[in-house]
Interface confidence: low
């Protein structure tokens, strides 16, 4: 079940975000989060993550990308990118060439 | 917004026996690992035993043998059932407990107060 915290064991990870109460944190994983808000520059999180492993495996998007990993401090210097914005869909009646 | 209580410290001869237990209470979502450590005068702070939620303990190798730890995942309480006790057992133990509060973003280290543990010759 994704939304129960993880009964494995605990890492340590970098945290860089407004929610950190010091430099590291303590989770069942280490996160990074980059988020697009609407027209404001990507902001990049780093932490612990404990619910909703599911998140991990998203695909990047255009306003989020979130990276998860398993070890001590891995996310420490990760840097992550958004997928290009798409460009419009091609309209009705073209041949794509 | 966490609180440990400890009890089951005292005085008891060598060879001795105790039992000590510690119950956490506040917005407590869940409880990964909690765990024991000691204190001794004039010492650093050491692991004396840790047991995870699924049950796996491990042990400080000086009490290997003579300490159980054991937890109750349902009342947040765990156990340190302490035989064959030595004057080197002498310390203040401490309760720890890793955990998840509501709202949280991760786990946080909580402590308790400390509950003073003699062994007398």
């Known amino acids: 079940d994704p939304v129960k915290p993880s009964r494995g064991p605990l890492v340590t990870c970098t945290c860089e975000s407004p929610h950190c109460k010091g430099p590291t944190c303590r989770g069942a994983w280490c996160t990074v989060v980059l988020v697009r808000e609407e027209g404001r520059h990507p902001q990049e999180h780093r932490g612990c993550g404990n619910l909703h492993r599911e998140l991990c495996r998203g695909r990047p998007t255009e306003f989020v990308n979130h990276y998860c990993c398993d070890s001590h401090l891995c996310n420490h210097n990760v840097s992550l990118v958004l997928e290009a914005t798409q460009p419009p869909s091609e309209q009705p009646g073209t041949d794509g060439q | 917004q966490v609180q440990l209580v400890e009890s089951g410290g005292g005085l008891v001869q060598s060879g001795g026996s105790l039992r000590l237990s510690c119950a956490a209470s506040?917005?407590?979502?869940?409880?990964?690992?909690m765990g024991w450590y000691r204190q001794a005068p004039g010492k650093q702070r050491e692991l004396v035993a840790a047991?995870?939620?699924?049950?796996?303990?491990n042990y400080a190798d000086s009490v290997k043998g003579r300490f159980t730890i054991s937890r109750d995942n349902a009342k947040n309480t765990v156990y340190l059932q302490m035989d064959s006790l030595k004057p080197e057992d002498t310390a203040d133990y401490y309760c720890?407990?890793?955990?998840?509060?509501?709202?949280?973003?991760?786990?946080?280290?909580?402590w308790g107060q400390g509950t003073l543990v003699t062994v007398s010759s």
């Open positions: 720890n407990a890793v955990g998840l509060l509501r709202g949280g973003y991760w786990y946080e280290d909580w």
């Open positions: 047991i995870t939620r699924g049950g796996t303990a």
């Open positions: 506040g917005s407590i979502i869940s409880i990964n690992d």
